[in-house]
Interface confidence: low
């Protein structure tokens, strides 16, 4: 601690602040009657250099002048930018055991003169705000540097503020604390920034501006919207603005959108009518303001107003499909299905659907409302029936969509030809077909319908379907398609009053089945063996099964087994074989094959035919 300097003094020439690259002479002098006791000649003055409180050099060899026992002068060079501490110590050479005693110290600051400040920019936020200016100070000076911001204007207006930069804080912005009012709109103002430190001073070029150049209006606030007559597409946006605002920019978008609708409004006076909104849609609105049509700056965007437009009655056509099942000789069950409207068609929350089933001669009409997307009724098998469905929200209902109820697979001449199903990737299947060969009436549309081939799927799950125009012969089905599951796919050709269909199975991805079929029984009838089995559990099929294989060989034989390959049919669970010898014991088992390969074998059963073999 060199706070007192009782033993002597330290001085610096030319000054304790020097430009980068300059040398300095540091003199250390003992006060009278100070020094090593009784032996002035043994006084040795040493100079130590510290950077960041760490001793970095003993300047013993830099002595340029020495009054033995009284004072010494050292030359220091190559000082780095910033502050360096030098401490002079007294070393009494006759007493080796005592450490050197601090005499005094000095800090030398190395820096540069300030550059002229540049890029002055001034703003006043709002009509009631104050003028604040910022600038670029240029290179770091490494010295305490004072900055003065001066403003002058009409009617002898002058104003100035000061701040400083050092190693702890940076000064490149000042708020003058004065307000420029709109009545000075045409007046010119001049600002200048002056920088001064111990090594020099510099001044910026004068920067001239007008009120309009620097005043940035406050963003609009208190934004709200009124929907005219509860309209979902027209609304009046209202807001509060500063009094001098003449131009507004409005931007608005649905919340899930990525592009804004932009509108410029002149002299809006806090109100603007919007006419192109989408009903029942979450919107975000923001507004910006400007004080002058040509000059000046836009305000920041206001805080967002987020709101949902009111509902309007649904538009669009429901996509309807149906299933027919005969119950007995004079009754049939009709199950109607439809897809939900998309939001732009629903234009609100769909509260219910109005369903009508009508015999075309108008003898019988069944009507109901439901909140579901399906409806089932039992009707007579006689007569020609038509169905219609419309969707309703709080504002009204969509136009009803009609469909004729025909026998979907009743006309062989309308059955599409060469139906194929190819897996495209993990989650879709490409279905292609050829038109019916000898249709006696024009195909109005195709319907591609699919359903997972799992137990109970007809009753548990509604079908999935796609409507295809009559000139298209392919469909890529992806809704609810999962890998390793077999789907039954039907292509329906519909005319005005008839339907024909063809069916195929398909999967989007397949593996060999996990297990083989389980043989449940082997029975002998009329010199033929009937093999009965249970199908592989649905999760273990891993795609569409193409064939079953029945293998057999004589027990204890090492020969290759014989096999019989049968086309997979879901309804079939037994098959005859007739090439086994009587009174020979055989081992039999089964496997299943998908497009990816064969399953492991199922259970083995032994059987010894008794009858006469062919």
């Amino acid at each position: 601690n060199i706070d007192v300097c009782k033993l002597g003094t330290v001085t610096v020439q030319p000054a304790p602040v020097i430009p980068l690259g300059s040398a300095a002479n540091i003199s250390c002098s003992l006060n009278p009657k100070q020094g090593c006791s009784h032996y002035p000649s043994s006084n040795e003055l040493i100079l130590l250099k510290f950077v960041n409180d760490v001793l970095v050099e003993n300047l013993h060899g830099k002595k340029v002048h020495d009054h033995t026992g009284h004072s010494s002068t050292f030359q220091v060079t190559n000082l780095s930018l910033g502050m360096t501490l030098f401490v002079c110590k007294l070393n009494c050479s006759n007493s080796q055991k005592k450490p050197p005693v601090p005499v005094c110290g000095v800090e030398i600051s190395v820096g540069v003169a300030p550059e002229p400040p540049q890029n002055i920019s001034c703003v006043q936020e709002g009509e009631n705000g104050t003028v604040a200016c910022s600038w670029n100070s240029g290179k770091v000076t490494y010295l305490k540097t004072n900055y003065t911001l001066q403003l002058s204007g009409p009617n002898n207006l002058t104003c100035q503020k000061q701040c400083f930069s050092d190693n702890r804080q940076n000064c490149n912005r000042l708020d003058l604390g004065i307000n420029l009012s709109p009545d000075l709109a045409e007046s010119r103002f001049i600002v200048r920034v002056t920088a001064i430190n111990d090594l020099g001073n510099s001044s910026s070029l004068p920067h001239t501006f007008t009120f309009l150049d620097i005043v940035i209006p406050l963003p609009p606030w208190d934004i709200r919207i009124n929907f005219l007559n509860a309209s979902g597409s027209r609304g009046t946006l209202q807001w509060e603005d500063e009094g001098q605002v003449v131009l507004n920019q409005l931007r608005y978008q649905p919340l899930n959108s990525t592009s804004w609708n932009m509108v410029n409004a002149t002299n809006a006076k806090g109100k603007y009518d919007l006419r192109d909104l989408r009903p029942f849609t979450e919107y975000e609105f923001q507004i910006s303001s400007k004080l002058h049509l040509s000059g000046g700056s836009w305000s920041n965007w206001s805080e967002s107003l987020r709101t949902r437009t009111p509902e309007e009655e649904p538009v669009g056509i429901l996509d309807i499909w149906y299933m027919k099942q005969d119950i007995d000789y004079d009754r049939q069950q009709i199950s109607l299905f439809w897809k939900s409207l998309n939001p732009s068609e629903a234009r609100g929350k769909i509260l219910h659907y109005q369903v009508t089933l009508q015999e075309v001669t108008k003898k019988t009409t069944l009507q109901n409302t439901t909140r579901h997307t399906s409806w089932t009724r039992v009707i007579p098998r006689t007569g020609a029936w038509t169905a219609s469905v419309s969707a309703a929200n709080s504002k009204g209902a969509s136009a009803p969509t009609h469909i004729n109820i025909v026998d979907l697979c009743g006309t062989g001449l309308l059955a599409p030809h060469q139906v194929s199903a190819k897996s495209e990737n993990m989650d879709n299947i490409l279905v292609t077909w050829q038109p019916p060969k000898k249709a006696d009436s024009a195909v109005r549309e195709y319907i591609v319908e699919w359903r997972a081939l799992q137990p109970g799927s007809i009753t548990k799950f509604p079908p999935h379907w796609l409507r295809i125009p009559p000139d298209n012969m392919s469909a890529l089905i992806s809704e609810n398609i999962k890998p390793y599951i077999c789907y039954e796919i039907r292509v329906h050709a519909l005319s005005e009053s008839q339907g024909g269909c063809s069916s195929i199975r398909g999967d989007s991805k397949h593996k060999a089945p996990v297990s083989g079929p389980h043989i449940t029984a082997i029975t002998e009838k009329k010199e033929r063996l009937f093999i009965s089995w249970t199908h592989i559990p649905f999760p273990e099929q891993r795609g569409c099964i193409l064939h079953y294989r029945i293998y057999w060989k004589e027990r204890d034989s090492t020969a290759q087994p014989e096999l019989c390959e049968i086309q997979y049919r879901r309804s079939q669970n037994s098959h005859p074989i007739s090439s086994l010898q009587p009174r020979v014991t055989y081992v039999l088992w089964m496997t299943a094959v998908t497009a990816a390969g064969e399953s492991p074998q199922g259970n083995e059963r032994e059987f010894c035919p008794q009858g006469k073999a062919n």
């Epitope: 606030w221 208190d222 709200r224 919207i225 009124n226 929907f227 209202q238 509060e240 107003l305 987020r306 709101t307």
Partner: nanobody, 119 residues
């Protein structure tokens, strides 16, 4: 439904002060934007001052700027209009109004309180 009850009106000399209060009931006050309006005899109702639900934004008619202050205390469920340096042309029935911050005009209105400034 929101009910609004104004209080604090009365007769005052020109240059005097009054403080109007408005206490909504029936729903959460802190989500309502509030406003003060006035209607002088034979004139249309005009906005005096408004305050956003958070209190962060205020608006004043030019005729009351610097004299009137709108504020709110969400903890006390009350909105205020502090009126200083009152002038005879401030004489009117003063109405408190509230609206949902989401959107819309001022949906809820009080019965009004009479402010009379004598010269």
């Amino acid at each position: 439904q929101v009910q609004l009850q104004e209080s604090g009106g009365g007769l005052v000399q020109a240059g005097g002060s009054l403080r109007l209060s408005c206490a909504p009931s029936g729903r959460t006050f802190s989500t309502l934007a509030m406003g003060w309006f006035r209607q002088a005899p034979g004139k249309e109702r005009e906005v005096v001052a408004t305050i956003s639900w958070s209190g962060g934004r205020t608006y004043y008619a030019d005729s009351v700027k610097g004299r009137f202050t709108i504020s709110r205390n969400n903890a006390k469920n009350t909105a205020y209009l502090q009126m200083n340096n009152l002038r005879p042309d401030d004489t009117a029935v003063y109405y408190c109004a509230a609206r949902e911050t989401d959107y819309g005009a001022y949906d809820y209105w009080g019965q009004g309180t009479q402010v009379t400034v004598s010269s």
